[in-house]
């Protein structure tokens, strides 16, 4: 038969950061290839990554159409060298993925401090707004555009000479903090979606940036 000795995929896993979304699975193929299908709960199946020997498939283009929808994917296994034939009625083995809702489940990528500027005893710290592949009216949206006020940034800041980390929060991408005059400070930011309750609620911390280095400006 057309699917003799093919093994169904297993361990289907969604890997998604800032909506860049890849489905991964096992096993590495031996004499077989895979095709992926994706659909929303109420939609039709759409085929992607036709007859691939890879064990991953980039589904970003599909999920960004509506990041608040819940998606399901499935991976079909075919013999190597398989060619679609109109006469074949036998369904190849396949495995379903877990459901995936991008808005709730995509991981938050590591943020970046774009700049900081000191004026007297105030410092304005700006977080870079990451672009995503989510589109509205043919325009790519930033992370802030997509999440709006659901996305919080926590700023950790500390005197270069001390270890205690003060915090500030914003639901924009800007912080305005008070600092002691004549002291150098270091900064790190973390993205948080407080409404989430699982591991994807926080990003990893941004790289640390310190005053006296190139990203900063100081004005009296």
């Amino acid at each position: 038969s057309g699917t003799t000795n093919t093994v169904a995929a297993y361990n289907l896993t969604w890997k998604s950061t800032n909506f860049k979304t890849i489905l991964e699975w096992e096993p590495k193929p031996i004499n077989q290839v895979y095709t992926v299908q994706i659909s929303t709960k109420s939609g039709d199946w759409k085929s992607k990554c036709f007859y691939t020997a890879d064990t991953e498939c980039d589904l970003t283009d599909e999920i960004v159409k509506d990041v608040k929808q819940t998606y399901l994917a499935r991976v079909f296994s075919y013999p190597a060298g398989h060619v679609e034939s109109t006469g074949s009625t036998e369904e190849p083995p396949y495995e379903n993925s877990p459901e995936f809702t991008p808005y709730l489940e995509t991981n938050l990528g590591q943020p970046t401090i774009q700049s900081f500027e000191q004026v007297g005893t105030k410092v304005n710290v700006t977080v870079q707004d990451e672009w995503t592949l989510v589109r509205r009216n043919d325009t790519f949206l930033s992370l802030r555009d997509v999440f709006g006020k659901d996305l919080i940034y926590t700023l950790y800041y500390w005197k270069s000479s001390s270890s205690g980390k003060k915090t500030a929060k914003t639901n924009t991408n800007e912080f305005l903090i008070d600092v002691d005059k004549g002291e150098n400070y270091c900064f790190s930011v973390q993205a948080v979606i407080p409404s989430r309750r699982t591991a994807n609620r926080k990003s990893t911390d941004s790289p640390v940036e310190c005053m006296g280095h190139e990203k900063g400006e100081s004005r009296e």
Epitope: I152, T154, Y156, S163, G164, K165, K166, T167, A168, K169, T170, N171, I177, D178, S188, Q190, V192, P194, R197, T198, A199, R201, K202, D205
Partner: antibody, heavy 120, light 107 residues
Framework: EVQLVESGGGLVQPGGLLRLSCAAS????????IHWVRQAPGKGLEWVGY????????YYADSVKGRFTISADTSKNTAYLQMNSLRAEDTAVYYC?????????????WGQGTLVTVSS | DIQMTQSPSSLSASVGDRVTITCRAS??????VAWYQQKPGKAPKLLIY???FLYSGVPSRFSGSRSGTDFTLTISSLQPEDFATYYC?????????FGQGTKVEIK
């Protein structure tokens, strides 16, 4: 169900040390921030310090800086308050509380508290 | 550090009364203010967050408001279970600071 349970309180002499534990269940501490707050007998609430278990960052009230250390073991889902060089004025009920890290960061869940008495 | 000045320190009221407690921040704290209720021998419980948002499960007779750096907790109709001590707290900056507390007693 979210729960925080403190333990480790007791009677200790001035200059002594004590380690308090805050065991969390119903949530993962690495995804939140944990604070310690104390309340001396008949007095108000005083913030002691915090830890973000995801990165180990901490900050302390001036009254305990250099004497108290907050740590966390994410594998045990537990935060700790190590108290050294204890003074009579450290006598209080010690609470741990969860910070939801929203914009206003309220402490949405608190433990039941553990009493620390510093006396000779 | 930001000071939170709470008043009154205590008040006597009857069941059914409207009760107002205020907190003044020593500098701008935006809306990063919470209110807690504490009963003797118990841990504090969150009532209001972000100055005016009612925490889940808290009766609607509790409300919070903000005017600049002044924050108000109102109990529209005091119930027997509301006799307790109330604290405001700012968490706009580190360290977070509490008001001194207001003890609501039975008249």
């Amino acid at each position: 169900e979210v729960q925080l349970v403190e333990s480790g309180g007791g009677l200790v002499q001035p200059g002594g040390l004590l380690r308090l534990s805050c065991a969390a269940s119903g949530f993962t501490i690495a995804y939140y921030v944990i604070h310690w707050v104390r309340q001396a007998p008949g007095k108000g609430l005083e913030w002691v310090g915090y830890i973000d278990p995801s990165n180990g960052y901490t900050y302390y009230a001036d009254s305990v800086k250099g004497r108290f250390t907050i740590s966390a073991d994410t594998s045990k889902n537990t935060a700790y308050l190590q108290m050294n060089s204890l003074r009579a004025e450290d006598t209080a009920v010690y609470y741990c509380a969860r910070d939801d890290q929203s914009l206003s960061s309220p402490f949405d869940y608190w433990g039941q508290g553990t009493l620390v008495t510093v006396s000779s | 550090d930001i000071q939170m000045t709470q008043s009154p320190s205590s008040l006597s009221a009857s069941v059914g009364d409207r009760v107002t407690i205020t907190c003044r921040a020593s500098q701008d704290v935006n809306t990063a203010v919470a209110w807690y209720q504490q009963k003797p021998g118990k841990a504090p419980k969150l009532l209001i967050y972000s100055a005016s948002f009612l925490y889940s499960g808290v009766p609607s007779r509790f409300s919070g408001s903000r005017s600049g750096t002044d924050f108000t907790l109102t109990i529209s109709s005091l119930q027997p279970e509301d006799f307790a001590t109330y604290y405001c707290q700012q968490h706009y900056t580190t360290p977070p600071t509490f008001g001194q507390g207001t003890k609501v007693e039975i008249k």
